[in-house]
Amino acid sequence: AQNITARIGEPLVLKCKGAPKKPPQRLEWKLNTGRTEAWKVLSPQGGGPWDSVARVLPNGSLFLPAVGIQDEGIFRCQAMNRNGKETKSNYRVRVYQIPGKPEIVDSASELTAGVPNKVGTCVSEGSYPAGTLSWHLDGKPLVPNEKGVSVKEQTRRHPETGLFTLQSELMVTPARGGDPRPTFSCSFSPGLPRHRALRTAPIQPRVWEPVPLEEVQLVVEPEGGAVAPGGTVTLTCEVPAQPSPQIHWMKDGVPLPLPPSPVLILPEIGPQDQGTYSCVATHSSHGPQESRAVSISIIEPGEEGPTAGSVGGSGLGTLA
């Protein structure tokens, strides 16, 4: 069978090979389409120019005034010329509809490097067959599930027209130190060949690079955190970031009920002050960042290192 592609809504003429160009003709068309139950026979005598359905023209061709999805199928003609020679024609008709230009909706104006971001949703309306949507970065195809690229797709069919609406949501994780203004576009590729792709207008979001966090430093005085009973320990939390973050203190993994401050003073150390201390810096743009932990211990006079179970001390430290 000869393959024919016809655009929905357009007229279609199928030639009946071997048929005399003018009446009278001995020919018969057989159709098996979405409009017919099994094979339907059409003769040259049926139908009129005023009809909006398939009919045989005076030259023996089959005419469909406006092709629809229901007209997909097989069309056969059997004709006999004036000398009695029989000729058969066989067509396989497929229909298509080019959608409107695809669009990117809900597009992001800014992306953050190093984390997944929704770039936008590409929408194509009114295609048949469905076709496909694909994304491009700086003109090159983006491959889903590679290098931080993910795509969520959805296909819907219009209940009356039978035409398709496609949606494709793009998520990317921009690399740190990459292009600060990448160009994204989306294109629709038709389900039937020989039709060029339709591309959206490009979008160019900015890529925002978060400043890498420098480590929060915890400085202990005296060094090593070992102190004689009744002595004083000063803990200083140093954060290079600007503006200065809020500093909270932890002991043995539990927050200390103290107002924020970069310095914690433990005067007149007693056994209850012994433990593991750390500070937590909270930035407005990032999450909390914890320092390394240091161990505070009491040493008896004459001892080289810390000893447990020492007595004395005043309890909770004070803030400078």
Partner: antibody, heavy 117, light 112 residues
Amino acid sequence: QVQLQQSGAELAKPGASVKMSCKASGYTFTTYWMHWVKQRPGQGLYWIGYINPSTGYTEYNQKFKDKATLTADKSSSTAYMQLSSLTSEDSAVYYCARWAGYTIDYWGQGTSVTVSS
Amino acid sequence: DVVLTQTPLSLPVNIGDQASISCKSTKSLLNSDGFTYLDWYLQKPGQSPQLLIYLVSDRFSGVPDRFSGSGSGTDFTLTISRVEAEDLGVYYCFQSNSLPLTFGSGTKLEIK
């Protein structure tokens, strides 16, 4: 050869109905649609409507929608037209004519209808 | 409705003369299928109409070649190259491009 033999002349009273026939021969009756045309004495031709004898589907000129009813009997290869609620305006010759898919090619000899009280 | 206007209403001719009848339509009769559905009929006195020309210019079987049709769109002409006595009667143009189908008002061909 193609022949369309129409029934004889009708004389009817105002308000009455008449049913005329058109017997086809020389071709396959169900393959061709049958049209009907009116011609008043000394006047032109007016299309009434057509019937597809294969399916019984009909299409009428709006001007004749309430006047004419077209039917067909496949077994006898005969098309019929009934005219109702006759008035003097319906006095005319009525032709059946075969539709070939692109033109009307053969006509019956006509049935004369006279409406008179 | 499509109105077909024929001119002249009456055409007196001599036998052997050429005769031309015009038919003008209020709408184009060119169908989306590429064909133009305009036909010509002759109704001889006391007879049924008979088909002469279909699809503007195609002669029906048995019609002498002195009859020819021409035109396109909305303007059409029937020409009889050499009129013979048997050609007398009323000529009608007819359109089947759209419903309702309509006929021209007729042109009477008569001897001078």
